[in-house]
């Protein structure tokens, strides 16, 4: 389109812009490391750094991990966004006694007003219940309507706190105690993983969930405990860790209480198709180190296409370890030096030569 030529020329004269033929206009060139928020950015504000999933861009322009709400006394208030952290708060029926950045370090159950006291302000995620003396004529056994109701999903049955004189404090705090923990969990109807055949009410038979350990007195740091080889995901469910049991995989990071095991292809291989926390398809690394390649004498030096041999075989060459030393052995198997995190060698069979051609066939 000749009418577009002046615009294209204008772009070419400006190093901070480029011409996008698809949209036929000048676009702002995002600086190195910044990600355009639209196809044709127009100004610097249309560019931003791209963070990995579960990270956000903080005010200092750093990718920072979003907090996790995986403790069973927390729920997600706002999700992890590109420019803001996930925000956690205490689950219904609890309040935060020790705050933390974007979360709460310690949640306690809302107090139930003792006999002779009524609720002045109901508990919230941030504040405990505030009690006040009951008006005359109200039955002490039923000092407030809340104390006479059956507990619902938002309230937790528990012993009443020791009465506190209104002169010293108008509110009481009930620490989470081990003795009532399972009852409290059952009453709060915590969600379980969909593949779990049992409910929290029967924790001893739940395959993904272990009976929760009693909490230290006054501690809110009690979490749902998953069975071995399960982790607590962000939705608070016990989820199976991925397995690295395939022959071509090795464990990169172990299964932890709040994160899956991660797997990667064994040394000498490369991931051809990824999967969550793992690699769906590993192939032998298809290009030999330059100084060790074995090839027919009549083969062209450049523009050689190397085809990956079948899975489980290696190219017909001795890959040079990163430290430059020769492999420990070459027959009948090759020893490839594992990367710098591990100082062991891994025998890899060499049952098939690599197909070499200059045509890519």
């Amino acid at each position: 389109f000749p009418q577009d030529r002046p615009f294209e020329d204008t772009c070419h004269g400006n190093p901070s812009h480029y011409y996008d033929k698809a949209v036929r206009r000048c676009c702002y060139r995002c600086p190195m490391g910044l990600f355009p928020t639209q196809q044709c950015p127009q100004r610097p504000t249309d560019c931003r750094k791209q963070c990995e999933p579960d990270y956000y861009l903080d005010e200092a322009d750093r990718c920072t991990a979003c907090v996790t709400c995986s403790r069973d006394d927390l729920v997600e208030k706002t999700p992890c966004a590109w420019n803001s952290s996930r925000v956690c708060e205490c689950r219904p029926g609890m309040f935060c006694s020790t705050s933390a950045v974007n979360s709460c370090a310690r949640c306690f159950f809302h107090s139930v007003c003792p006999a002779g006291m009524i609720v002045k302000f109901p508990g919230t995620a941030q504040k405990n219940t505030v009690c006040e003396p009951a008006s005359p004529g109200v039955s002490p056994a039923c000092a407030s309507p809340e104390n006479c109701k059956e507990p619902s999903s938002g309230t937790i049955p528990q012993a009443k706190p020791t009465p506190v004189s209104p002169a010293t404090s108008s509110a009481s705090t009930m620490p989470v105690r081990g003795g009532t923990r399972l009852a409290q969990e059952a009453a709060s109807k915590l969600t379980r993983a969909p593949d779990s055949p049992s409910s929290v009410g029967r924790p001893s038979s739940d395959p993904g969930l272990s009976p929760t350990q009693p909490c230290p007195e006054g501690s809110g740091d009690c979490r749902k405990q998953c069975e071995p080889d399960y982790y607590l995901d962000e939705a608070g469910r016990c989820t199976a860790c991925v397995s690295c049991s395939r022959d071509d995989l090795v464990e990169k990071t172990p299964c932890a209480w709040n994160s899956s095991r991660t797997c990667e292809c064994r040394p000498g291989m490369i991931c051809a198709t990824s999967a969550t926390n793992s690699c769906a398809r590993c192939v032998p690394y298809p290009i030999c180190a330059a100084e060790t390649v074995t090839k027919p004498q009549d083969m062209a030096e450049k523009d050689t296409t190397f085809e990956a041999p079948p899975l489980g075989t290696q190219p017909d060459c001795n890959p040079t370890p990163e430290n430059g030393e020769a492999p420990a052995s070459t027959s009948p198997t090759q020893s490839l030096l594992v990367d710098s995190q591990a100082s062991k060698t891994l025998p890899i069979p060499t049952s098939a030569p690599v197909a070499l051609s200059s045509t890519g066939k």
């Epitope: 791209q50 990995e52 990169k252 991660t262 797997c263 990667e264 292809c265 064994r266 040394p267 291989m269 490369i270 991931c271 198709t273 990824s274 999967a275 969550t276 926390n277 793992s278 690699c279 769906a280 590993c282 690394y285 290009i287 330059a290 390649v293 030096e301 450049k302 523009d303 050689t304 296409t305 190397f306 890959p319 990163e322 990367d339």
Partner: nanobody, 122 residues
Framework: EVQLVESGGGLVQPGGSLRLSCATS????????MAWYRQAPGKGCELVSI???????YYADSVKGRFTISRDNAKNTVYLQMNSLRPEDTAVYYC????????????????WGQGTLVTVSS
């Protein structure tokens, strides 16, 4: 931290061509192998092609005969010439540094650069 900048993506009709570039000035370019990976919406990160420092190449079966990888060590740039494009080539394309060492896990998309979007549609 090494930054790679991919460019050259855009909207193209089936059968069309695009040339992607990946530039960096953060390392001695003539040392490591370089690779192109791609990630289609809702799919995993997929290896497309690798080029060694001395010009030897590898291509995934799905792109063989249509894509050509090359590099200009003097310009610290690696290229991916994509011909006979198909709708299934639609993805964000990423270049990766030293895939022998860095791409054993499923994390070679968006590891260094922001990628460049290639859309093949009529």
């Amino acid at each position: 931290e090494v930054q790679l900048v991919e460019s050259g993506g855009g909207l193209v009709q089936p059968g069309g061509s695009l040339r992607l570039s990946c530039a960096t000035s953060a390392f001695t370019f003539d040392g490591p192998d370089m690779a192109w990976y791609r990630q289609a919406p809702g799919k995993g990160c997929e290896l497309v092609s690798i080029i060694s420092a001395d010009g030897r190449t590898y291509y995934a079966d799905s792109v063989k005969g249509r894509f050509t990888i090359s590099r200009d060590n003097a310009k610290n740039t690696v290229y991916l010439q994509m011909n006979s494009l198909r709708p299934e080539d639609t993805a964000v394309y990423y270049c990766a540094l030293d895939p022998r060492k860095n791409c054993r896990g499923g994390y070679c998309c968006a590891n260094w650069g922001q990628g460049t979007l290639v859309t093949v549609s009529s």
